[in-house]
């Protein structure tokens, strides 16, 4: 498959398990892959009684489920871990839960960056 219109070169990166896995906790991830493959951004999170717990964000390999999605929208009804993917730089900064079966749309905005 060729590259999509919204070519993904960079994604927001996050790893809640960064200490155990000895990675950065957050930042940017540059997406690099094979010439004929598309790349995407993704986000995964938990929702415990309305409290959002971010799990992972980053680049995601060529996945037909993510094609031509400009926004990161999870559609599963009530999973243990929510997942969304999208195309376009930093498209995983915000993420949304919009169940296919209908129901309220919930959008999660990233917290404002603390002044340095």
């Amino acid at each position: 498959s060729g590259r999509g219109e919204a070519e993904t070169r960079e994604c927001i990166y996050y790893n809640a398990n960064w200490e155990l896995e000895r990675t950065n906790q957050s930042g940017l991830e540059r997406c690099e892959g094979e010439q004929d493959k598309r790349l995407h951004c993704y986000a995964s999170w938990r929702n415990s009684s309305g409290t959002i717990e971010l799990v992972k964000k980053g680049c995601w390999l060529d996945d037909f489920n993510c094609y031509d999605r400009q926004e990161c929208v999870a559609t599963e009804e009530n999973p243990q871990v929510y997942f969304c993917c999208c195309e376009g730089n930093f498209c995983n900064e915000r993420f949304t839960h919009l169940p296919e079966a209908g129901g309220p749309e919930v959008t999660y905005e990233p917290p404002p960056t603390a002044p340095t």
């Epitope: 398990n17 155990l20 896995e21 000895r22 990675t23 991830e29 997406c31 690099e32 892959g33 790349l39 993704y42 995964s44 992972k56 980053g58 680049c59 995601w60 390999l61 996945d63 037909f64 489920n65 999973p79 243990q80 871990v81 997942f83």
Partner: antibody, heavy 120, light 107 residues
Amino acid sequence: EVQLLESGGGLVQPGGSLRLSCAASGFAFSSYAMGWVRQAPGKGLEWVSSISTSGGSTYYADSVKGRFTISRDNSKNTLYLQMNSLRAEDTAVYYCARSPAHSPHPFDIWGQGTLVTVSS
Amino acid sequence: DIQMTQSPSSLSASVGDRVTITCRASQSVSRFLNWYQQKPGKAPKLLIYAASNLQSGVPSRFSGSGSGTDFTLTISSLQPEDFATYYCQQSYSSLFTFGGGTKVEIK
């Protein structure tokens, strides 16, 4: 052609050491995470260890932690597995495998495997 | 560690049959789930990654589905070259784990 070629397997006594090597060719080695997966005779696949693109992050199965060390030399396009304090239960075919740097990190290319036999 | 359980551990089928193999994770692995095929004396081969994406060069009779804890590998019409052992693997945790395998034998 993308290729991984393991070497270094053989017969070793319990408590002994062995170093496996995996020579990579046909792709940008430093752009991929790498791993070792083993298979005991007649058994299933067991993930052993993985290493990040730069070598800065390493991961081990509980069964080998503290005894095995994974490393890589990007200038030589080579992956290593140093195995110390070997036990009979470490007897297996050891495969090296390539893993894209991005999630969900599948093992997309595998070597042919090298047999490690731990026996007195 | 995340445990991966495959069922059945073995099955007998005929050429042309539709075959379904299931894989269950002890906790959610989201879509961080890959499937491999292994023939005797050979290295494993990646079939499906990210739960449902066909790896390049793999025939379209193979398909994957599922997310969270329950996943399925389906072979729509079994071919002679498909008799092999199939493994699922989670990569949600940095400590990867494989399922125990499902051996597909000729009936």
